[in-house]
Amino acid sequence: KKVVLGKKGDTVELTCTASQKKSIQFHWKNSNQIKILGNQGSFLTKGPSKLNDRADSRRSLWDQGNFPLIIKNLKIEDSDTYICEVEDQKEEVQLLVFGLTANSDTHLLQGQSLTLTLESPPGSSPSVQCRSPRGKNIQGGKTLSVSQLELQDSGTWTCTVLQNQKKVEFKIDIVVLAFQKASSIVYKKEGEQVEFSFPLAFTVEKLTGSGELWWQAERASSSKSWITFDLKNKEVSVKRVTQDPKLQMGKKLPLHLTLPQALPQYAGSGNLTLALEAKTGKLHQEVNLVVMRATQLQKNLTCEVWGPTSPKLMLSLKLENKEAKVSKREKAVWVLNPEAGMWQCLLSDSGQVLLESNIKVLPTWSTPVQP
């Protein structure tokens, strides 16, 4: 008996061939021996089976002795043995229809679990193997689960169902809802305008939800909510914003926040959360602000940074075009009795400058100038 695998929702064509290359009488029946379709001369006739409105044949092939049964919009319950009767012969074809669906939704939040469920006909014992967009293979039976979805899991999952040495392939598009970056850091000189951007790693037709930015300033004992906002069809509207600092927010995606000026008291880290409509859980992006200040007080030239810096970052003070006078893995450095000239305060990581602030030291009879 020939075995054919089909996919739920697809169309399958079961073949039936006569030795005579001409149009002769044929019938397709199901395992209950109820007629699905056949011919009466050149006319296609259909029986009362449940396939009645989804079954067809190709009349153009009848003259060549081919009498296919085409079943559209396949259902799991279409799995059956189909019998083609032609020239006093019976050809049997076993059709097995499978369906593969993702749990509840194909749009999942980062960190959530993806469960793929295989619908299969009674009596079948298929095996399933799925390959994620990043090339990870998972195997299973009726259900396959992937916990802790990552951004790289977004894309087309290819799943192969194996039954009776035959296979059928499913493609499922999974969208992992996440921000492009889990964390970002912004380095700014005191007084500069700060731009925070929170680009999403996915695009959807309509995006609705609400969000909030909580901020933990380095100098503060507790965190506070800086801004809350709503998102409706990709349009952003601010609900509530603190008076200090008075953040501004862009009206369109990507989510964009502007802090009028970087001040040491704002240095710290924030957590932007976005709750999407009809989704359980929230999207998170961490954002960090490091603020630098260079000052000269009497005979002391000081450079300080505030905010979450890594212990491997180097803070240096140097006179322009000269070697660093002082260089430490600390958050403050200073030079006593600095020479006159343009001094540079540098925050660097393995030689790469992350933040730079210049201060002009005038001869001792003058006051310093900050460009």
Epitope: I34, T45, K46, P48, K50
Partner: antibody
Framework: QVQLQESGPGLVKPSETLSLTCTVS????????WSWIRQPAGKGLEWIGR???????TYNPSLKSRVTMSVDTSKNQFSLKLSSVTAADTAVYYC??????????????WGQGTTVTVSS | DIQMTQSPSSLSASVGDRVTITCQAS??????LNWYQQKPGKAPKLLIY???ILETGVPSRFSGSGSGTDFTFTISSLQPEDIATYYC?????????FGGGTKVEIK
Amino acid sequence: QVQLQESGPGLVKPSETLSLTCTVSGGSISTYYWSWIRQPAGKGLEWIGRINTSGSTTYNPSLKSRVTMSVDTSKNQFSLKLSSVTAADTAVYYCARELERYYYYGMDVWGQGTTVTVSS
Amino acid sequence: DIQMTQSPSSLSASVGDRVTITCQASQDISNYLNWYQQKPGKAPKLLIYYASILETGVPSRFSGSGSGTDFTFTISSLQPEDIATYYCQQYDSLPLTFGGGTKVEIK
């Protein structure tokens, strides 16, 4: 066991629409085809058409232009609408369950029938 | 549509008589034929399917035969409770169609 009960007005005016409902009790409406059959007084049976719970319908070509069938799975009911009625549509209307089993296809459960008269 | 022609339209026989009803299809319907019994004021009841298979619980005095276009329904020994109208119905193709019926009475 499964029982069927037809309901609807017994009198319909010519050119109006005949509306009947069949309520399925004692079993699920799912997985089967449900049909309507009519029988004018002293005459034979005429299959009007059938519907399943997916809403898939097949109508008798002789009535197709006037027939609409629908299903309400939440109420375990299916309905028949026959438009532009004339006196020739006066009959006993039966609802029935269509069953397929080995070598058999036919109506295995019937309602008791409801008489519809078309008259002004 | 497949036309089903039943004959006779009515007959009268004595209790114990052998009663035969014929049904002719307008085209080949293989064995896809049912026979129903309908008593006055009641819904039809299935007696025979696939031309000759007796439905469970139906007395063995009822039988059916034939294939293709010509079919026969027989009551081997008519009983008083057999007074009814008998219908053939094809299920080879949609629409399902019935014969005109044969009314059986007792003399």
